[in-house]
């Protein structure tokens, strides 16, 4: 005996009460896949989260996170409040970052300035706290007749403070 | 049945004061960390402040600093926020929610009803 349930399509289910008819996904659920027996609840985009798109009988409401928010996990679970630049999130809220460190971005970790003499530059623009140091030429790339009348900040090392 | 009530809301003038209520029943607030979120007649919600279990407190909006003050009373399972000079534009509904931190929220967040705070002259 063939299943009719395979015959039922996404945005339906399959109603064994009614000797296994197709009916419409009530209001607030949907199916993404034909066949099935039950359709699923809706998503409620509520509290933090606002709603991306709506739900319809054939997908599920995407939600967003509000304003100073942002999402985190799959399908935006979570959402995780947005620090300023310049700062990282902690156990103990939003903390600037350490003199040496920075961050561009409204979420993430302060990361460490660029080490210029690694690569053997100079230091172009020094880094703050929102801004990564900036390398330039190596001194040697320098031409005593063609230096710059603005001579290339020192580099300042993580741990001391400005002056 | 876990739930949080918010309560103290009311109409007060322009420089008053008011002091909101977050009553937790069926769980621990002790446990959990309590945020205040408002939102205020067709805008999106916004976050308030926030005290974590062991009492830190984070202050989302920027506009509330020096105005807005958090506390809990474990012992009576409440969180209190009390809002001083208060301005027409903090006219909202205040909603408490028991985040485990207050740094990220999730789907599962107990979030109470709401109270309404209008400020008018």
């Known amino acids: 005996l063939q299943d009719l349930c395979s015959n039922c399509p996404a945005g339906t289910f399959c109603d064994n009460n009614r000797s296994q008819i197709c009916s419409p996904c009530p209001p607030n659920s949907f199916s993404s896949a034909g066949g099935q027996r039950t359709c699923d609840i809706c998503r409620q985009c509520k509290g933090v989260f606002k709603t991306r798109k709506e739900c319809s009988s054939t997908s599920n409401a995407e939600c967003d996170c509000i304003s100073g928010y942002h999402c985190l996990g799959a399908e935006c679970s979570m959402c995780e409040q947005d620090c300023k630049q310049g700062q990282e999130l902690t156990k103990k809220g939003c903390k600037d970052c350490c003199f040496g460190t920075f961050n561009d971005q409204k979420r993430g970790i302060c990361r460490p300035w660029t080490n210029c003499s690694l690569d053997g530059k100079s230091v172009l623009v020094n880094g703050t706290k929102e801004r990564d140091v900036v390398c330039g030429p190596s001194p040697a790339d320098l031409s005593p007749g063609a230096s710059s009348a603005t001579p290339p900040a020192p580099a300042r090392e993580p741990g001391h403070s400005p002056q | 049945q876990l739930q949080l009530v918010e309560s103290g809301g009311g109409l007060v003038q322009p420089g008053g004061s008011l002091r909101l209520s977050c009553a937790a029943s069926?769980?621990?607030?002790?446990?959990?960390?309590i945020g205040w979120f408002r939102q205020a007649p067709g805008k999106e919600r916004e976050g308030v402040l926030c005290?974590?279990?062991?009492?830190?407190?984070?202050i989302y909006a920027d506009s509330v600093k020096g105005r807005f003050t958090i506390s809990r009373d474990n012992a009576k399972n409440t969180v209190y926020l009390q809002m001083n000079s208060l301005k027409p534009e903090d006219t909202a509904v205040y909603y408490c929610?028991?985040?485990?931190?207050?740094?990220?929220?999730?789907?599962?967040?107990?979030w109470g009803q709401g109270t309404q705070v209008t400020v008018s002259s």
């Open positions: 929610v028991a985040p485990r931190i207050c740094s990220t929220y999730s789907s599962d967040d107990y």
């Open positions: 069926g769980f621990t607030l002790a446990d959990y960390a």
């Open positions: 005290i974590s279990s062991s009492g830190d407190v984070t």
